[in-house]
């Protein structure tokens, strides 16, 4: 890997642009903080592969370190991550900021930590104290990570100068957990086996070089003793472990399994537990309950999750209309099932960017050679309301005829509503909804129609205005569970011209208004 | 200097809402539990709210349950203390407190007290 | 809840007198509990964490102990800047509780 500039330490300007390249024999990637930052990568004609970093408007918050690592960095040689540290020296920032984790540093035993208290100029000098002390601790200060050293169970502050002002950082927690000297773990290959299955437990102990091993176990209770194994863990110094193998494990078999350490010179002793179930056979178990209609909105994405326990480890298929789903190549649907613990499973199918061709029936089936469970569910596929047509006409009847024509799903819902006095609606005039008396002014009439091909409803509605006197606003609005829409019309008495039609402006919209609903099959005269 | 400025209190009838604020100075805001502790006339100290760092955990006494609501931006490193239903058990002075609750280690929680808090804002619930 | 009793209510003390406060939990609080110290018209400041740990800057006449259900706060050597008021409060699951707290005051 070869950075540019190479390092390892750089000092730019706030506010200034900054350009770093990393290039390598295999694609590349910048990374902060354990993230990909925006970068443009490319590959040479000779098979070398760059990433530009293009650094922008910098402050002091970008102070800290930057790394180029392969792309797929598993397994890599620690050369094969480049390591380059910025400051930022900015006056407006202090000390960078720290999560909690940075800010309460727990230890289990006597051994050098960091304070990591760190500045934006690499020239400021910066001192430690204890939280509410005034004297400076003779501790080594790196400007890149802060102090070093063994630290009491106290808490301690970094100070620094920023032209004439003194500044503090946040107060850093150093506490030293009380542990035993002996300190055990249990752990298990597997906590659920199938009878016919081996149980395999490993009892470790960390730092002593003589201890004792005992096991209790359901075996043992009933006189059928099993030989631990001890060995010693040879890459590091005094772990010691205690293999427990029970083959062949029978139901009986399940219950606690305890790792009693003893170890005489200071008669220290820890003990340990873990439970094993010994099932009969395999199993899959839903958790929880996922409701037989989903619903999903066009246009977004939207995951559908289910969870479930299961042993051994099953295989997870999903399907829709009985056909199985893949992850596609365009990335529309993705299918991912997560191990969340030994025997829970979270899986997981993500419809991107949902189509209305994706409502339908769906099923999960998880499956070993000994359980299998299934879970289906409708799919419904929501689109938001959206009015495709309102139109006035004047039949020979003498009446005047609104219509109003929408789509969506779920059904929408239909309101009209209505402004006699132009110039005040609805500003000063609140909204009246019509519909409380009997004398018949108007009428309505609504057909909903349901378009299978579509998937959505279609509402047509029909307002039948019975005396129009004088210019009248109407509105068309509809509305259903994810979104509404609305449109207006001016309907003028027949006696106006149509030139005076065109004349009313949209400052005329105002006034009384009235609401008309589908429940409403009759609209009523207002005062 | 680190420092915590409540403000917000004031006279208010019974049944009444109020919002208190908590301006935090000098350290990171984001990176601490924070706690509103209250103190009726002449008596003693009565913890009433906190909430994590990010805003997804919040804790209350019983007795304030459902009416008040706690809540933080850490961009303008505040807190709020939101009052509704307000009576007359309810006047008290409020004080805002850092909460030093450090990430879960294993098994255990630790805790280091409440070691910065506010001067106090004065709510009082009377017709 | 976890309620925190504690003992005596006031308490009458000379400068140089020894002062013990004790201090009931209802239920085991381990050793999560910690001590304030407020004065007229203050605000609460703190003492003592986690039943025996002294806060930076806190003078080391004060010393608390405990686990369990039963602490205590001892002052050594009494001082005219300790006459105030003296709360203990217990930490458990996020929840706190604070006792009703004892009056020091001078003889």
């Known amino acids: 890997l070869v950075i540019t500039p190479p390092g390892p330490e750089l000092i730019l300007n706030v506010s200034s642009t900054f350009v770093l390249t990393c290039s390598g024999s295999a694609p590349v990637v910048w990374e902060r903080m354990s993230q990909e930052l925006p970068q443009e990568m490319a590959k040479a004609q000779d098979n070398t592969f760059s990433s530009v970093l293009t650094l922008t408007n910098l402050t002091g918050l970008d102070t800290g370190e930057y790394f180029c690592t392969y792309n797929d960095s598993r397994g890599l040689e620690p050369d094969e991550r480049k390591r380059l540290y910025i400051f930022v020296p900015d006056p407006t920032v202090g000390f960078l900021p720290n999560d909690a984790e940075e800010l309460f540093i727990f230890l289990t035993e006597i051994t050098e930590i960091t304070i990591p208290c760190r500045v934006t100029d690499p020239q400021l000098v910066v001192t430690l104290h204890e939280k509410k002390g005034d004297i400076a601790l003779p501790v080594p200060y790196d400007h890149q990570r802060g102090f070093s050293g063994i630290f009491e169970d106290r808490s301690y502050i970094c100070k620094t100068t920023i032209g004439d002002r003194e500044v503090d950082s946040d107060a850093y927690y150093v506490y030293r957990l009380q542990v035993s000297s002996i300190n055990v773990s249990v752990n298990a290959v597997q906590t659920v086996v199938r009878q016919g299955e081996n149980i395999t437990l490993m009892c470790i102990v960390i730092g002593n070089e003589v201890v004792n091993f005992e096991w209790m176990y359901p075996r043992k209770e009933s006189g059928r003793l099993v030989e631990p194994v001890t060995d010693f863990l040879l890459d590091m110094p005094y772990h010691i472990r205690s293999i427990l193998h029970i083959p062949s494990a029978e139901l009986e078999d399940s219950g606690t399994y305890t790792c009693n350490v003893t170890e005489s010179v200071n008669d220290h002793q820890d003990e340990k537990a873990i439970n094993i179930t010994v099932v009969e056979s395999g199993y899959v178990r839903l958790l929880g309950e996922v409701g037989a209609l989903q619903f999903a909105e066009l246009h977004r994405s939207r995951t559908l999750q289910v969870v479930f326990e299961a042993y051994p480890p099953p295989t997870v298929l999903w399907f829709k209309d009985n056909r199985t789903l893949g992850d596609s190549s365009a990335g529309e649907i993705a299918l991912s099932t997560r191990n969340v613990s030994e025997t829970r499973y979270v899986s997981e199918l993500t419809l991107v960017r949902v189509k209305v061709a994706e409502a339908g029936h769906y099923t999960m089936r998880a499956f070993h050679e000994d359980a299998e469970v299934q879970l289906s569910f409708q799919l419904q596929i929501n689109v938001p309301v959206r009015v495709l047509e309102l139109s006035e006409s004047h039949p020979d009847s003498g009446e005047q005829t609104v219509r109003c024509r929408g789509r969506g799903m779920p059904q929408p819902n239909i309101i009209w509503s209505a402004c006699r006095d132009l110039k005040r609606c609805p500003r000063e005039l609140p909204p009246m909804l019509l519909g409380n008396s009997s004398e018949e002014e108007s009428q309505l009439e609504t057909n909903v129609t349901y378009w299978e091909e579509e998937q959505e409803f279609e509402v047509v509605s029909t307002l039948r205005l019975q005396h129009v006197d004088r210019p009248l606003s109407v509105r068309c609005t509809l509305r259903n569970a994810v979104g509404q829409d609305m449109q207006e019309v001016i309907v003028v008495p027949h006696s106006l011209p149509f030139k005076e039609q065109k004349l009313i402006s949209e400052e005329d919209l105002g006034g009384e208004q009235k609401l008309i609903s589908e429940e409403d099959l009759h609209h009523h005269h207002h005062h | 200097e680190v420092q915590l400025v409540e403000s917000g209190g004031g006279l208010v009838q019974p049944g009444g809402s109020l919002r208190l604020s908590c301006a935090a100075s000098?350290?990171?805001?984001?990176?601490?539990?924070m706690s509103w502790v209250r103190q009726a006339p002449g008596k003693g100290l009565e913890w009433v709210a906190n909430?994590?760092?990010?805003?997804?955990?919040?804790h209350y006494v019983d007795s304030v349950k459902g009416r008040l609501s706690i809540s933080r931006d850490n961009a303008k490193k505040s807190l709020f203390l939101h009052m509704n239903s307000l009576r007359a058990e309810d006047t008290a002075v409020y004080f805002c407190a850092r909460d030093l609750v450090p990430p879960r280690q294993d098994d255990y929680y630790y805790y280091f007290g409440m070691d910065v808090w506010g001067h106090g804002t004065t709510v009082t619930v009377s017709s | 809840d976890i309620q925190m009793t504690q003992s005596p209510s006031t308490l009458s003390a000379s400068v140089g007198d020894r002062v013990t406060i004790t201090c009931r939990a209802s239920q085991s609080i381990s050793d999560w509990l910690a001590w304030y110290q407020q004065k007229p018209g203050k605000a609460p400041k703190l003492l003592i964490f986690k039943a025996s740990t002294l806060e930076s800057g806190v003078p080391s006449r004060f010393s608390g102990s405990g686990s369990g259900t039963e602490f205590t706060l001892t002052i050594s050597s009494l001082q005219p800047d300790d006459f105030a008021t003296y709360y203990c409060?217990?930490?458990?699951?996020?929840?706190?509780?604070f006792g009703q707290g004892t009056k020091v005051e001078i003889k």
């Open positions: 909430m994590n760092q990010d805003g997804s955990e919040t």
């Open positions: 000098g350290f990171t805001f984001s990176s601490y539990w």
């Open positions: 409060q217990q930490y458990n699951s996020y929840s706190r509780t």
